[in-house]
Interface confidence: low
């Protein structure tokens, strides 16, 4: 099942621009905050650390002083700025700090640097699938499927809840798949017969959702008493 | 120069077994620490265990370290594997610098661990078709073993996607295959599993009604989306 804690952790920027990433460490007022980059297939590597006591940045050797900046805003909100972005800057950026002998990492922010001309709206487009009668009759359960298409970037989180409940329900999902220049993903939820008459919500977190809020796709309650016939023999 | 090598790019193991992840390192430091982290699919990086160069083998719950200082080897064993242990595991060498709080970690490339369901009697799947407009989904439930071929049968295919095969809460497998078809109403699904063929039509109910459950009368059947 999907974990939806924290903000959407992706930032998409065109080449040549700059990006700002916010640190989300659980440790407040750490003196030293480190920034790491992890790119697929490579080892995570430290880029720099920020010494808040002396308000200075210490770069790893080979790291350009013009490329990265970091500064503290209020509380534990440390900002990390990347300038003159190129596609090779894409990856997952983590802030980290030492806390009693172990290094704690933030939840990571995926930076996608792209030259592609994308549609104006690259938020996830939903399609809903309701349970088949066969499933509800044979198995006394029903599966809702939430299809999301034509979104960019590929970082997306999906979870399910009953209406009027904040409990996250156990769901399953496929891998995010590339379709032309955008992505698609689907998630499904199987519920027992007694829950089929409740409204369910597929909740989607994505960087390009309208107004930056979670998109809620409503799955209506369904009647399971339409059919009482037996299934075919098999 | 300091270096960390994780030679295994991926390993698979059934639940309840143990898996050992190897990590070799190079260092000239006289005293150091080695850390193991778990990276979730969400990219969250979680600290697991720490091994000091002058300490006995570290152990924490189901995680244990076999540390051989002379060989510069620090293997992590995860015992009694659970499905939630599926993740990428990173070994990292801690650099002792002027201040521990400024120390960097030197990471390996990571090892992906896939935890599979326990070996169990073969179970044939249930197959159901779900539709919305031109979209068709074939839902394949509760089968074992994992090997399966799912075919959406149609003469008017627009596009099809690779199936998603996941472990079900009961420790078997579930799968979904999606496609888009001009004649979605006539699409059926057939599945090859364990040298047998199973059809969605085998599970259809005898009725004149449509093959979908109905929303309650007061509900909208469209796909409302609040943003």
């Amino acid at each position: 099942s999907s974990n939806l804690e924290g903000r959407t952790k992706s930032v998409t920027r065109p080449t040549g621009s700059s990006a700002v990433i916010t640190c989300d460490l659980p440790v407040e007022n750490a003196v030293y905050t480190h920034w790491y980059l992890h790119q697929e297939g490579k080892a995570p590597q430290r880029l720099l650390y920020y010494d808040s006591y002396n308000s200075r940045v210490v770069l790893e050797s080979g790291i350009s002083r013009e490329k990265y900046h970091t500064y503290a805003s209020t509380g534990k909100s440390l900002k990390f700025i990347l300038e003159n972005l190129i596609e090779r800057d894409s990856g997952v950026y983590y802030c980290a700090t030492w806390d009693w002998g172990k290094k704690l990492f933030g939840s990571g922010t995926t930076l996608v640097v792209t030259d592609k001309q994308l549609d104006a709206d690259v938020s996830p487009k939903p399609t809903i699938f309701l349970p088949s009668i066969a499933e509800t009759k044979l198995q006394k359960a029903g599966t809702y499927l939430c299809l999301l298409e034509k979104f960019f970037p590929d970082v997306i989180k999906i979870h399910w809840q009953e209406k009027k409940s904040n409990t996250i329900l156990g769901s399953q999902e496929g891998n995010t798949m590339k379709t032309n220049d955008t992505y698609m993903k689907f998630s499904w939820l199987t519920v027992p017969e007694k829950s089929l008459d409740k409204e369910h919500r597929c909740i989607v977190r994505h960087e390009n959702n309208k107004n930056g809020v979670d998109q809620e796709i409503i799955f209506p309650p369904i009647k399971t008493d339409v059919i009482t016939m037996d299934p075919k023999d098999n | 120069a300091q270096k960390v090598t994780q030679a295994q790019s991926s390993v698979s193991m059934p639940v309840r077994k143990a898996v050992t992840l190897n990590c070799l390192y190079e260092t000239s430091w006289w005293s150091y620490y080695i850390f193991w982290y778990k990276q979730l699919p969400s990219k969250e990086m979680i600290f697991l265990i720490r091994q000091g160069s002058d300490e006995q083998n570290a152990k924490s719950g189901r995680y244990s370290v076999n540390f051989k200082k002379a060989a510069k080897s620090v293997a992590l064993t995860i015992s009694a594997l659970q499905l939630e242990d599926s993740a990428k595991y990173f070994c990292a060498l801690g650099e002792p610098n002027h201040f521990l709080n400024t120390d960097k970690l030197i990471f390996g490339k990571g090892t992906r661990v896939t935890v599979e369901p326990r070996s169990q009697p073969h179970t044939k799947p249930s197959v159901f078709v779900m539709k919305n407009g031109t979209n068709v989904a074939c839902l394949v439930k509760e089968f074992y073993p994992k090997d399966i071929r799912i075919n959406l049968v149609s003469s008017k295919k627009i596009t099809e996607f690779d199936p998603a095969i996941v472990i079900s809460p009961s420790g078997k497998y579930n799968a979904v295959k999606l496609g888009k078809y001009e004649d979605s109403n006539s699409v059926t699904c057939s599945v090859q599993h364990d040298n047998k063929t199973v059809h969605s039509t085998d599970f259809e109910v005898k009725t004149d009604s449509t093959d979908h459950v109905k929303p309650k009368e007061t509900e909208n059947t469209k796909q409302p989306s609040k943003s």
Partner: antibody
């Protein structure tokens, strides 16, 4: 008031063992580190071992590694130095010391900066002789 | 290991004199250097930390400075209670190391 009191010193034969204690008051061992420093008669200061008891990090001088073990019991607010396989050259006054954290972020940042030693015990003499 | 080479090993001075003791680190130790004063039969006392910061309660006649890997302790006007042995210490890297000590005696 911060205080460190060592005990456990004495005369021991070569190859023998001793356990030194360092009882702390005025601060908690778990929120700091404790260090042992020794001084042979008429000689200079030599750092021996350090422990960061909240995490279990330990460090040793090469001259004692494998023979000495530093530990702490946070419930007793006491640090220990277990000395085995003692040699004549281990004869010294043994001091325990606490580091000085000079800036306000110390507790927030996890206390992992090394630091100079501002509080020392009175010392306990260990004599290794046959 | 970082060696701390302290000089002189001893010096004779009079009350009111300006006294300078130096310590050279074998490699960079940032500013993680401290100076201690020790009198016979007593534990060392912290005078200077972080190369140049005066520890609370220490008279202002004591000062510390750094130039690269050279560290200096200066007593601007020697007082009778200052006759003692002085040690430098680097604590920026394990193993922590001390200088050999400088004994300041009455001339």
């Amino acid at each position: 008031e911060v205080q460190l009191v060592e005990s456990g010193g004495g005369l021991v034969q070569p190859g023998g063992s001793l356990r030194l204690s360092c009882a702390a008051s005025g601060f908690t061992v778990s929120s700091s580190s404790i260090h042992w420093v020794r001084q042979a008669p008429g000689k200079g200061l030599e750092w021996v071992a350090s422990i960061y008891s909240s995490s279990g990090y330990t460090y040793y001088a090469d001259s004692v590694k494998g023979r000495f073990t530093i530990s702490a019991d946070t419930s007793k607010n006491t640090a220990y130095l277990q000395m085995n396989s003692l040699r004549a050259e281990d004869t010294a006054v043994y001091y325990c010391a606490r580091p000085y954290y000079w800036y306000p972020y110390y507790y927030w940042s996890g206390g992992w900066e090394y630091a100079a030693f501002d509080y020392w015990g009175q010392g306990t003499l260990v004599t290794v002789s046959s | 290991d970082i060696q701390m080479t302290q000089s002189p090993s001893s010096l004779s001075a009079s009350v009111g004199d300006r006294v300078t003791i130096t310590c050279r680190a074998s490699q960079s130790v940032s500013s993680a250097v401290a100076w201690y004063q020790q009198k016979p039969g007593k534990a060392p006392k912290l005078l200077i930390y972080s190369a140049s910061s005066l520890y609370s309660g220490v008279p202002s006649r004591f000062s510390g400075s750094r130039s690269g890997t050279d560290f200096t302790l200066t007593i601007s006007s020697l007082q009778p209670e200052d006759f003692a042995t002085y040690y430098c210490q680097q604590y920026g890297e394990y193993p922590i190391t001390f200088g050999q000590g400088t004994k300041v005696e009455i001339k």
